[in-house]
């Protein structure tokens, strides 16, 4: 328990102290007091540095004194031979004696008293930052006006925190600026602007004077700016050392000014303003920005338009432009949207042709369409090369987005016809010599394939059967062979409007306009045994001259049989119409004069008995194309004749080309168009 005073005596005092003794006294006075220790008697064996016997006075870790020998008072009115004063409330006294004493020593006598200390003056470290006030047993600190005492009850500071600045422009300065700023203070200022604006701080070098850094470069007083996770500073020294313009990229800024106890300077002054948050001018490939500006800021909107051949895709749909807004966080909206190459997709397949699998279907890629040669060719030209265009379509230089059309090659037999033996002046033939040859089984007749959907024949063949069964691709018309060949199903029969329909067709004498078209339900697939014959051109090159040779083919009557099972063919010349008129009709159904001969008929034959006959009707009279020797065209159709083995009459197809084209056009499907 602390006491205000007390006495300390060496062992056995005033008798001689014993050898080999060590004794200590812990003196404690109340808090706020120091200790005054007075020695009134001292008689201890003398030795160098008091090594043998001694009394030691210790304060904390400090030895205040070590005594030995004899002392007497210098003042006849005072018994005090030695005194010690410490500004602390604790003191330790230690007495030690060694193993022998050469004489008899009586030791020491001492007393202590608690004395008031002046905390304000007695210590090297001043306890108060500003005003120190001493009283008996303690002290208290106080502050000048406008300062307040911190919770530690020692330090004074300025109440400079808590200000929040929300205006878009403002000025902030250290306390008392330009007078010296307060020591030992922490000033915090907050700038809080509307989202979308960044705080920009502006300082002038001469508006900044803060206590300089220590030798280690640490600021003793410091100014720091904190914006989100970014910090600017600490700054100190004479003249602002940082950038004079600080773009914080944030709408919130904390300014922290920290000062220590010493070295006050004039401080600092700054201006701030809110700048609309900038957004970076991003490099967005394959696009253009509108409007183009050097700097974009909060609320700016740009239209980003993809270059030709590029688009923004979302799911299965795309757009060529989009809008992007500079947002309050300094980032662009829609930054995920990228202009990517247009994808034209897998190219459409075409009938009777193919397109190779493209390596790429993106903008600029090239594909090639080809037709199934040698049976089909590209009717609408363009060469079959298409590139992926900017609008997402496969485009050809000639046709644009229109797909190539593979149409059958006409008039080219896979194998040329060569006469062998005579059968009504004709020879055996193979269907490959006449791939256009169509077989009608009721009535037994012929026809000519002119494209995928149409068969040309004689009107008299179909006038009695508007739903004829037809076959293509077979040399033999035996039932077993026909079962394996391609049967054609008619959709509609179109008889020329100039063909006169009779109640008793057997008595017919007028075969003018003996021509008909059969529209097929399904397209015919072309190949080596099935391909169409060409139609004549409209120019004078296709006007037949007497002596021009043509080929006829069919399964009609021969010298030996009423019907042929295998295909027969013959080459015959064109003859003047009078040659046909001169031949006597074999089984006339009327007067010879009643038979009608018109310019719509071709007369041919009369050479080596080669002729068409019953059962060949509707088959083509095929003539070599004058403009392309590799092709045959249907110059005529087997129509009628006065007598088999002489001359025959053929419908002059050239006179009906317009009707044929018009009929086909008016009755085609959209796919054919």
């Amino acid at each position: 328990e602390p006491t205000m005073y007390g006495e300390i005596l060496s062992p056995n005092y005033p008798q001689a102290y014993p050898s080999e003794v060590e004794k200590s006294w812990d003196i404690e006075v109340p808090e706020g007091y120091g200790i005054h220790l007075y020695f009134t008697h001292l008689d201890i064996e003398l030795s160098e540095n008091c090594a043998y016997d001694s009394v030691q006075i210790i304060s904390g870790d400090t030895e205040e004194g070590r005594l030995c020998g004899q002392r007497s008072s210098n003042n006849p009115h005072s018994p005090i031979v030695e005194e010690f004063q410490v500004p602390y409330n604790k003191l330790q006294v230690i007495f030690k004696s060694d193993f022998s004493n050469e004489e008899r020593f009586t030791g020491f006598a001492a007393y202590y008293v608690a004395t008031d200390i002046n905390e304000c003056t007695d210590f090297v470290d001043v306890p108060c930052s500003h005003f120190c006030n001493n009283f008996i047993g303690g002290y208290f600190c106080s502050c000048p006006p406008e300062y307040f005492l911190h919770d530690d009850m020692k330090n004074c500071g300025v109440n400079c925190s808590g200000d929040v600045f929300t205006a878009l422009i403002g000025e902030i300065a250290s306390p008392n600026y330009p007078k010296p700023y307060p020591e030992n203070s922490r000033c915090e200022y907050q700038i809080r602007l509307e989202k979308g604006f960044q705080v920009v701080v502006t300082l002038r070098r001469e508006d900044f004077d803060v206590e300089a850094a220590d030798s280690a470069g640490n600021c003793l007083d410091s100014l720091v700016f904190v914006a989100g996770d970014r910090q600017f500073g600490p700054y100190c020294g004479h003249g602002f050392p940082g950038p004079l313009n600080i773009e914080t990229k944030s709408n919130a800024l904390d300014i922290i000014f920290q000062t220590d106890l010493t070295g006050q300077k004039k401080g600092w002054k700054l201006r701030y303003h809110g700048d609309p948050m900038p957004c970076p001018k991003e490099d967005t490939p394959n696009s253009v920005w509108e409007p183009a500006k050097a700097k974009y800021v909060f609320r700016d909107v740009v239209q980003i338009t993809c270059l030709d051949g590029f688009e923004v895709v979302e799911g299965r749909v795309g757009a060529t432009s989009f809008y992007s807004t500079c947002q309050s966080n300094g980032k662009w909206s829609n930054s995920k949207l990228k202009c990517q190459p247009v994808d034209c997709g897998i190219p459409e397949s075409i009938e009777n042709g193919k397109v190779e699998d493209p390596e790429s279907t993106l903008f600029g890629s090239v594909i090639h369409y080809t037709c199934e040669e040698p049976y089909y060719y590209m009717e609408n030209g363009g060469g079959g090369e298409y590139h992926c265009a900017g609008n997402g379509s496969w485009v050809n230089e000639v046709l644009g987005p229109e797909l190539p059309k593979c149409v059958p090659v006409c008039g080219v037999p896979r194998e040329p016809f060569e006469e062998k033996q005579r059968i009504i002046g004709g020879s055996d033939a193979d269907i490959k010599n006449f791939p256009w040859q169509v077989f009608f089984d009721n009535p037994w007749a012929g026809g000519a394939l002119i494209n995928e959907y149409w068969v040309l024949t004689a009107a008299h063949v179909v006038e009695g059967n508007r739903e004829p069964t037809m076959y293509v691709g077979s040399t033999s018309v035996q039932t077993s062979r026909l079962a394996k060949s391609k049967m054609l199903t008619p959709e509609h029969v179109f008889i020329h409007p100039g063909w006169k329909l009779l109640e008793v067709p057997e008595g017919r004498t007028n075969f003018d306009n003996d021509i008909a078209l059969v529209r097929l339900k399904d397209p015919v697939k072309m190949g080596p045994t099935v391909s169409p014959i060409c139609l004549p051109g409209t120019s004078s090159d296709y006007n037949l001259m007497d002596g021009d040779l043509g080929l006829i083919s069919g399964w009609g009557r021969t010298e030996k049989r009423d019907r042929a099972v295998r295909l027969k063919a013959a080459r015959l010349p064109v003859a003047p119409l009078r040659k046909c008129k001169e031949v006597k009709v074999e089984k006339p159904t009327a007067d010879a004069e009643a038979y009608v001969f018109t310019p719509n008929m071709i007369c041919a034959g009369g050479e080596k008995g080669m002729d068409s006959c019953k059962g060949d009707s509707g088959g083509a009279f095929a003539v070599q194309d004058p403009n392309d020797k590799t092709k045959f065209y249907a110059a005529g159709l087997v129509s009628w004749g006065p007598q088999c083995g002489t001359y025959g009459l053929y419908t002059r197809v050239k006179n009906y080309v317009d009707w044929i084209m018009k009929t086909m056009q008016e009755n085609s499907t959209p796919r054919e168009d």
Partner: antibody
């Protein structure tokens, strides 16, 4: 196929918070923006905000600023919307939606009822 | 914020009718406008994007037009399944705002 499946209905007291989840399948949320839209009973649609799950950037409508937090967990392909300090007028169906160019896919909606 | 105003608020029509809904923006939104259809108890469905582009799978009777501040959604021949509420939405700038909706009812 693309699907957004939201968590179930919630009943909350005024002042409480609610967190609604939106689990995406058929696409990676990092490649899209995830939006939240709400619809009070017999009312129209109200856009609340969005997140870019790739970098966690968010934008909120001013009305909800400070009360709404949109987050995303790319490991589970899920977006979340948390609304705090609930009041009775926050009773609504909350939808998540995915966008690049437009809101092509929507969740089925989550009814949040705020009642004392 | 950009305000979107739809008119009319509601309208009655019959199957086969031609119907027009308009949407006005308080400031220029160029063509950054989408139209959505919502049926009771269902999530909204996208019909038209970028003012005039029909979203995939949307019937051709739906069409959109306009740019700047005035936009139109047209249904050329109303079908029974078209009775619903229609919303316009601007995606020109955040916040992305919706119109208040137009309820299309059977007459």
């Amino acid at each position: 196929q693309v699907q957004l499946v939201q968590s179930g209905a919630e009943v909350k007291k005024p002042g409480a918070s609610v967190k609604v989840s939106c689990k995406a399948s058929g696409f990676n949320i990092k490649e899209y923006y995830m939006h939240w839209v709400r619809q009070a009973p017999e009312q129209g649609l109200e856009w609340m905000g969005w997140i870019d799950p790739e970098n966690a950037d968010t934008i909120y409508a001013q009305k909800f600023q400070g009360r709404v937090t949109i987050t995303a967990d790319t490991s589970t392909n899920t977006a979340y919307m948390e609304l705090s300090s609930l009041r009775s007028e926050d009773t609504a169906v909350y939808y998540c939606a995915r966008s690049r160019l437009f809101f092509a896919y929507w969740g089925q909606g989550t009814l949040v009822t705020v009642s004392s | 914020d950009i305000q979107m105003t739809q008119s009319p608020k509601s309208l009655s029509a019959s199957v086969g009718d031609r119907v027009t809904i308009t949407c006005r923006a308080s400031q220029d939104v160029r063509t950054a406008l989408d139209w959505y259809q919502q049926k009771p108890g269902q999530s909204p469905k996208l019909l038209i994007y970028s003012a005039s582009y029909r979203y995939s799978g949307v019937p051709s009777r739906f069409s959109g037009s306009g740019s700047g501040t005035d936009f139109t959604l047209t249904i050329s021949s109303l079908q029974p399944e078209d009775f619903a509420t229609y919303y316009c939405q601007q995606q020109y700038t955040t916040p992305y705002t919706f119109g208040q909706g137009t309820k299309l009812e059977i007459k």
